[in-house]
């Protein structure tokens, strides 16, 4: 039995972050506020400028369950969400308008880094507690998928996109946000 799929009840999003950044200043402004709206004079794609792209992260909190067993402590992790695109071209909170070219490359926000965490499970009926290892999403990243490539092949975003990835095993993280649940791994 695997973990129950979580229900994504998060209500706000935060800008994409590296694995362990400094907390942003208190007065920082997010890119999807109205004051950042308005179409810029020109908006070329520049795959080399990683800073121009934005990947949104949600956090959520839940208890993990495995059948009748439940984690002794709740966990928190990230869910990768939203449309990746040049930061200045992301839709603002009012218009919800996409300004990037419809025939441009497709960008996806998917898990990038994971953190392994050992979790204690408490089971009913006086059963002994169990220990399991789970993988929790630690950061998200934009990946590029062009129309000229196989739809299932996600390319790393940034300067390394030109490198072919043949022979590379697909990571389990390359899934939709709704599948970003903690995964059981063999802990025995």
């Amino acid at each position: 039995q695997g973990w129950q799929a979580f229900r994504n009840d998060a209500t706000e999003v935060i800008p994409g972050l590296g694995e362990y950044p400094e907390p942003p200043p208190e007065n920082n402004q997010t890119m999807n506020r109205a004051e950042n709206g308005g179409r810029p004079p020109h908006h070329p794609y520049d795959a080399k400028d990683v800073s121009e792209y934005s990947c949104r992260e949600l956090h959520y909190t839940r208890f993990l369950t495995d059948g009748p067993c439940r984690s002794a402590k709740p966990v928190t992790e990230l869910v990768c969400s939203g449309q990746c695109g040049p930061a200045r071209l992301l839709p603002n909170a009012i218009g919800r308008v996409k300004w990037w070219r419809p025939n441009g490359p497709d960008f996806r926000c998917i898990p990038d880094r994971y953190r392994a965490q050992r979790v204690q499970l408490l089971c009913p009926g006086g059963a002994a507690p169990r220990s399991r290892k789970v993988r929790l999403v630690a950061s998200c990243k934009c990946k590029r998928l062009t129309r000229f490539h196989n739809q299932s092949e996600l390319k790393d975003f940034g300067p390394e996109t030109a490198r072919p990835q043949k022979g590379r095993k697909p990571r389990p993280g390359a899934r939709g946000a709704k599948a970003n649940q903690a995964e059981l791994e063999n802990a025995y």
Epitope: E12, I14, P23, P24, E26, H59, P74, V75, T76, L136
Partner: nanobody
């Protein structure tokens, strides 16, 4: 070692409001989430709401959406839970906890009792 102290609990009539506070000290985590949890008599502890270190990301359990609001004041190392339209099902001990993101909630306060009467 993170220490968390909750306050603001008490007895309130159904439909009323309360504001809980959680003050942290000794924090060493750089990227963390603070959550509120509650436990009613004879029931398991459940998630109420959580908020990221910057205050920009929040999460609410379905049962409290639209009624509760979580916020934080990093200058005071405090997290608040504004509870409105309280009902009998909101009765319980409310705990504040912190977790590294991602990770388990390893740091817990002692809890504050909230009792909603009819």
């Amino acid at each position: 070692e993170v220490q968390l102290v909750e306050s603001g609990g008490g007895l309130v009539q159904a439909g009323g409001s309360l504001r809980l506070s959680c003050v942290a000290s000794g924090r060493t985590l750089r990227r963390y989430v603070t959550g509120w949890f509650r436990q009613a008599p004879g029931k398991e502890r459940e998630v109420v709401a959580s908020i990221s270190w910057s205050g920009e990301s929040t999460y609410y359990a379905d049962s409290v959406k639209g009624r509760f609001a979580i916020s934080r004041d990093n200058a005071k190392n405090a997290v608040y839970l504004q509870m409105n339209s309280l009902n009998l099902e909101d009765t319980g001990v409310y705990y504040c906890a912190e977790a590294e993101l991602p990770g388990t909630y390893d740091y817990w306060g002692q809890g504050t009792q909230v009792t909603v009467s009819s």
